[in-house]
Structures are given as structure tokens and as C-alpha cells.
Interface confidence: medium
């Protein structure tokens, strides 16, 4: 029977800069049952505070609500292990809200076949923000990537779309079935997950684009 | 409270043109993250899917029966229009509308209608 | 498009039997599964969504699990109120599409 092994803060998240969450990974439990607690203060402060909210991310994690969550001040974490042998602390993590935002997928994805007369086709989608991000405050840019393929095909061709909320494709294989996504990141953050996917049939008189 | 109510007519001949109108009410067409899709259950069958409209005015259609198929919103009436043409005693069926609502990970039909019952027959 | 594929497509069952449900999609749809209840003459009633969200009001006897192509709809005590139709829906992919149902009967 040992104290616990050094646990780890392994990922922060937000999905509007509104409320974060942290996770970490649990050492070694030594044989014995392990309690955990995060504390943390903002940076120049020394008054600690233990985590808000054990529960809603789920197991080893903690969650900071709207009124725990500060953009513009730098959060210094740790987690504290502890067993009938002794204690042990994770490396200190400085968490910036404002870098660790991963929003939700956009949402309300469409995809037509628009075949204009005086012009070539073209494959036309569009989308909406993710409903938790408010763009109207101007604290956001979301950014966004489309990816398709062919039903059959392995790989995926991907278009920036930088921060249009609908963008335009010419170059398709007629009479293939293609697959479309579409995801979203902030201008400081990481990508969200793929959107669901729509499947859009190319008509077979669809003329490709020189 | 959120409701939905189908109208149109309860019986058309082969050929013609159905149109029915869903009347919303508890939440607006324009709401980000709603729509209202077009459901149909022929006598004894199965739901299948038709079509559906988001709040950003994206449509979508049935594969099978996409030529057939229109639909649109008139938010400031509250109601979503689907029309579907030629039709044949094939498609008589109970067609519903429901709400759909997205949001974090999650897509689905959370209020239906109550169905207004086409019968397709000469 | 995805195909979704639920069986049994009938079942006779007691009340208080815990009764499972399974739905197989064509390709993998995450966990974008939806199940329904359905009385007859009655519209269709949102269960579960997300494959294993509760939507409110719905008895926790009711639960779902599962995510990729395979996925459970479990009633944990069947009620007589439970005796009813039950589908399954992907809303990975549009064009969505329902399963063929499960009819659930009183033994």
C-alpha cells in the first residue's frame, strides 16, 4: 500500500468562453481508495479556491460555471490525490480561457445542386453558427472547414471556408453520391467536431468545371 | 406550450398536387436551432421522413422522393408549406410535421403534430 | 443513404419483463440516434435522443445506449402503458431515415 501516483491535468475546455471544463487522469491508486480535489486561484491572486463543480463534466473532472469563469484572467490549477499513505499534486496547469475554446459543431447543414442557365453548376451549402456562441458580441471569429468525398471513397477533400456561413464548389464527379460536413473553430482554439453529414446525389448531366 | 397542427385536404386524386400547411406555435420558425420536418406513416407501415427546413432556410429532401417534393416557411405566419406532386394511391398515408431541435450533439423530433390522415383515390 | 435496421420487429412480453430493443445502422452515425414511441392512432413521442438522453417527462425505466452502428433501447420494467410501436431514427446523414419498428405486445 502506497500513496498515489501523481495525477494529471490533461485537457480545458470551453464551448463559448462562457463556462470551461478541466479533466485529469488519476496515478497510480496505490491499493487503497484515492480522493481527488482541484483547486485552483487566478494569477495574482494567492487566495485558493476548490473546484466549483465535480460532477457535470463527469468523472475526474471540473466544471467552472458563468460565475467562475473569468476571460481575461489567467487560471493556475492543480490536483491534489490523496490516501490513507499520503498525498501527491499534479503539475500546475495556467489555463486562459480565451485559448482553450472548442465550440459544438454548426449546426442546420444543407446542400443543394444549383444548375444556373447562363452559368456552370455548382454544389451550394450552407449552415449556422453553433447556438451557444454568441457572434453578435464580436468576442468571437468563428472559422470554418468543409470536408466531402465521394459515398465510396476513403479520402476526404477539405475547403476553408474562413468565416462565411455558406460557400460554393464546383469541381464534383457527376452521378456520385458525395458525403458533406462541415466544422468550426475560433481564431484562438481548436476545431469542433464534424457537423452531421448530408448526402447530396451529382445529377450525370452535371458539367465539371474546366 | 409547443404545439403543431397539419391541415390540407383528407382526399386527393392521382395525379393532383397535395399541399399541406403546418401551423406552429410555442416557438418561432426563426429560432436558431429549430425546424420543422414532414413525417408520413402509411395505414399499418412504418415512419418515413420526407423533408424538413431549418431556421437558416436550409431544405432537405427524401432521396426517393426529392422531385416530388417542396417545401417552405412563412415565419411570420407561422406555418411550413410542403407540397407534393402527381400524387398516386401509393402515397396515402398520415403526414405529420414535427419540431426539430439542435443542439449539443443532438438532432431530433421533439414535438409531432397530430397527423392529418391523405387518402389518394379516384 | 443509411439504412436502419431494428429488431425484433415484434415482441410479446409481460408486464414487469425488461424488454430490449435493437437498431443497426448501414454506416457508422455516431451516437445521432433518436427513439420514438408510437400508441396507435396517436402521433409519435420522443423517448430518447443523442442514443442515451432522456428526454423530460420520460420514465427512467426507459434508457438507451450505444453509439457507431450499433444501439439498445431497454424498458428495464414494462408497464402497460408501455405496450406500443417503438422506432429508432438516425439523424446523422440527411436524408434521415426511421427504422421498420418494433411492436411491443402483451403476452
Known amino acids: 500500500q502506497l500513496p498515489p501516483g501523481k495525477p494529471e491535468i490533461f485537457k480545458c475546455r470551453s464551448p463559448n468562453k462562457e463556462t470551461f471544463t478541466c479533466w485529469w487522469r488519476p496515478g497510480t491508486d496505490g491499493g487503497l481508495p484515492t480522493n481527488y480535489s482541484l483547486t485552483y486561484h487566478r494569477e495574482g491572486e494567492t487566495l485558493m479556491h476548490e473546484c466549483p463543480d465535480y460532477i457535470t463534466g463527469g468523472p475526474n473532472s471540473c466544471h467552472f460555471g458563468k460565475q467562475y469563469t473569468s476571460m481575461w484572467r489567467t487560471y493556475v490549477m492543480m490536483v491534489n490525490a490523496t490516501n490513507q499513505m499520503g498525498s501527491s499534486f499534479s503539475d500546475e496547469l495556467y489555463v486562459d480561457v480565451t485559448y482553450i475554446v472548442q465550440p459544438d459543431p454548426p449546426l442546420e447543414l444543407t446542400v443543394e445542386v444549383k444548375q444556373p442557365e447562363d452559368r456552370k453548376p455548382y454544389l451550394w451549402m450552407k449552415w449556422s453558427p453553433p447556438t451557444l456562441i454568441d457572434l453578435k458580441t464580436g468576442w468571437f471569429t468563428l472559422l470554418y472547414e468543409i470536408r466531402l468525398k465521394p459515398e465510396k471513397a476513403a479520402e476526404w477533400e477539405t475547403h476553408f471556408a474562413g468565416q462565411q456561413t455558406e460557400f460554393k464548389i464546383l469541381s464534383l464527379h457527376p452521378g456520385q453520391k458525395y458525403l458533406v460536413q462541415v466544422r468550426c473553430k475560433p481564431d484562438h482554439g481548436y476545431w469542433s467536431a464534424w457537423s452531421p453529414a448530408t448526402f447530396i446525389q451529382i445529377p450525370s448531366d452535371f458539367i465539371m468545371n474546366d | 406550450q409547443v404545439t403543431l397542427k397539419e391541415s390540407g385536404p383528407v382526399l386527393v386524386k392521382p395525379t393532383q398536387t397535395l399541399s399541406l400547411t403546418c401551423t406552429v406555435s410555442g416557438f418561432s420558425l426563426s429560432d436558431a436551432g429549430m425546424g420543422v420536418s414532414w413525417i408520413r406513416q402509411p395505414p399499418g407501415k412504418a415512419l418515413e421522413w420526407l423533408a424538413h427546413i431549418f431556421s437558416n432556410d436550409g431544405k432537405s429532401y427524401s432521396t426517393s422522393l426529392k422531385s416530388r417534393l417542396t417545401i417552405s416557411k412563412d415565419t411570420s405566419k407561422r406555418q411550413v408549406v410542403l407540397t407534393m406532386t402527381n400524387m398516386d394511391p401509393v402515397d396515402t398515408a398520415t403526414y405529420y410535421c414535427?419540431?426539430?431541435?439542435?443542439?449539443?450533439?443532438?438532432?431530433?423530433?421533439?414535438?409531432w403534430g397530430q397527423g392529418t390522415l391523405v387518402t389518394v383515390s379516384s | 443513404d443509411i439504412q436502419m435496421t431494428q429488431s425484433p420487429s415484434s415482441l410479446s412480453a409481460s408486464v414487469g419483463d425488461r424488454v430490449t430493443i435493437t437498431c443497426r445502422a448501414s454506416q457508422s452515425i455516431n451516437s445521432y440516434l433518436n427513439w420514438y414511441q408510437q400508441k396507435p392512432g396517436k402521433a409519435p413521442k420522443l423517448l430518447l435522443y443523442f442514443a442515451s438522453s432522456l428526454q423530460s417527462g420520460v420514465p427512467s425505466r426507459f434508457s438507451g445506449s450505444g453509439s457507431g452502428t450499433d444501439f439498445t433501447l431497454t424498458i428495464s420494467s414494462l408497464q402497460p402503458e408501455d405496450f406500443a410501436s417503438y422506432y429508432c431514427?438516425?439523424?446523422?446523414?440527411?436524408?434521415?431515415?426511421f427504422g421498420q419498428g418494433t411492436k411491443v405486445e402483451i403476452k
Open positions: 431514427q438516425e439523424s446523422y446523414s440527411t436524408p434521415w431515415t
Open positions: 414535427a419540431r426539430i431541435r439542435t443542439g449539443t450533439y443532438s438532432l431530433y423530433l421533439d414535438y
